[in-house]
């Protein structure tokens, strides 16, 4: 059965938008007006995952691209990457764990915790134009809260 997906954009709690930075990286920066068209549109897929009260397992693909955010160990550190997949097989209900994020939503603020690496979150820096990364701290300098905006399919 096909997995259910919705198209959306994400902005961090400082209202920075996410854009492509090279073929396999996202960065966060403030955009206005026409430049808003540069922001990445995600296809958020509702996938299978661990049962938990307040966590909804999702996968975050780039709309109409065969790229998914995934979490892997690089030099022994949990790392966020954009991974290329076979579009014939993705998205699917049972995504590999590295593609799964636990969406935690409180008062329309979203956090995305790695299913593969608990307590590691999709994060942005306070600084402008820096890469989106996987961070192991919440409530510190780095930003882990996002808002979501729906995009017409």
């Amino acid at each position: 059965a096909p997995v259910r997906s919705l198209n959306c954009t994400l902005r961090d709690s400082q209202q920075k938008s996410l854009v492509m930075s090279g073929p396999y990286e996202l960065k966060a920066l403030h955009l206005q007006g026409q430049d808003m068209e540069q922001q990445v549109v995600f296809s958020m897929s509702f996938v299978q995952g661990e049962e938990s009260n307040d966590k909804i397992p999702v996968a975050l693909g780039l709309k109409e691209k065969n790229l998914y955010l995934s979490c892997v160990l690089k030099d022994d550190k949990p790392t966020l990457q954009l991974e290329s997949v076979d579009p014939k097989n993705y998205p699917k209900k049972k995504m590999e764990k590295r593609f799964v994020f636990n969406k935690i939503e409180i008062n329309n603020k979203l956090e995305f915790e790695s299913a593969q690496f608990p307590n590691w979150y999709i994060s942005t820096s306070q600084a402008e134009n820096m890469p989106v990364f996987l961070g192991g701290t919440k409530g510190g300098q780095d930003i882990t809260d996002f808002t979501m905006q729906f995009v017409s399919s």
Partner: antibody, heavy 120, light 107 residues
Amino acid sequence: QVQLVQSGAEVKKPGSSVKVSCKASGYTFDRYWIEWVRQAPGQGLEWMGEILPGSGDINYNEKFKGRVTITADKSTSTAYMELSSLRSEDTAVYYCARMYYDYDQGFDYWGQGTLVTVSS
Amino acid sequence: DIQMTQSPSSLSASVGDRVTITCKFSQDIDRFLSWFQQKPGKAPKSLIYRVKRLVDGVPSRFSGSGSGTDFTLTISSLQPEDFATYYCVQYDEFPYTFGGGTKVEIK
């Protein structure tokens, strides 16, 4: 508080159309699917389709495809379900319900229902 | 389409009885299963979502369990206001489908 208020009962002739409305209040209309479900007299519940007003995404039950049209007006927080080519077996109570965009909480609030009677 | 069977279609029970209603599906439906209560002439009322989560305000005598293809609604001690028809629904896959209902009547 959350409310889904539906339009009043309708009597329709076979072959005609009916449009039922569902006005939402007490929550962010954009972020919840509006579901349409019907119940024929003395029968069970049957899902017809859904719309997510924030994105415009719509999903229909194939059984009704071509006969049902679901729309939403964000400015008035109102969803609509139009069923065409009515026949006597479409006589039913039509309900709207809401479901969060991520499907987490299921059909958590329901409208009061709209009785549609199809009779010549 | 996912095929489903809700059983029993009706049952007679007394106040204080433990009541169990089951829904069986033709394939795994992950976590997207809810239970409703409906009284004559009224809209359905949500009791349980995501298999086992109790809706706010619903008494703790109601509980849900199960996984894969088999799911259960249990009323631990039936109260007078619980006499009604109960439905399960799967919203894992289109078209969403409701069970045929279980009418709980007074013995």
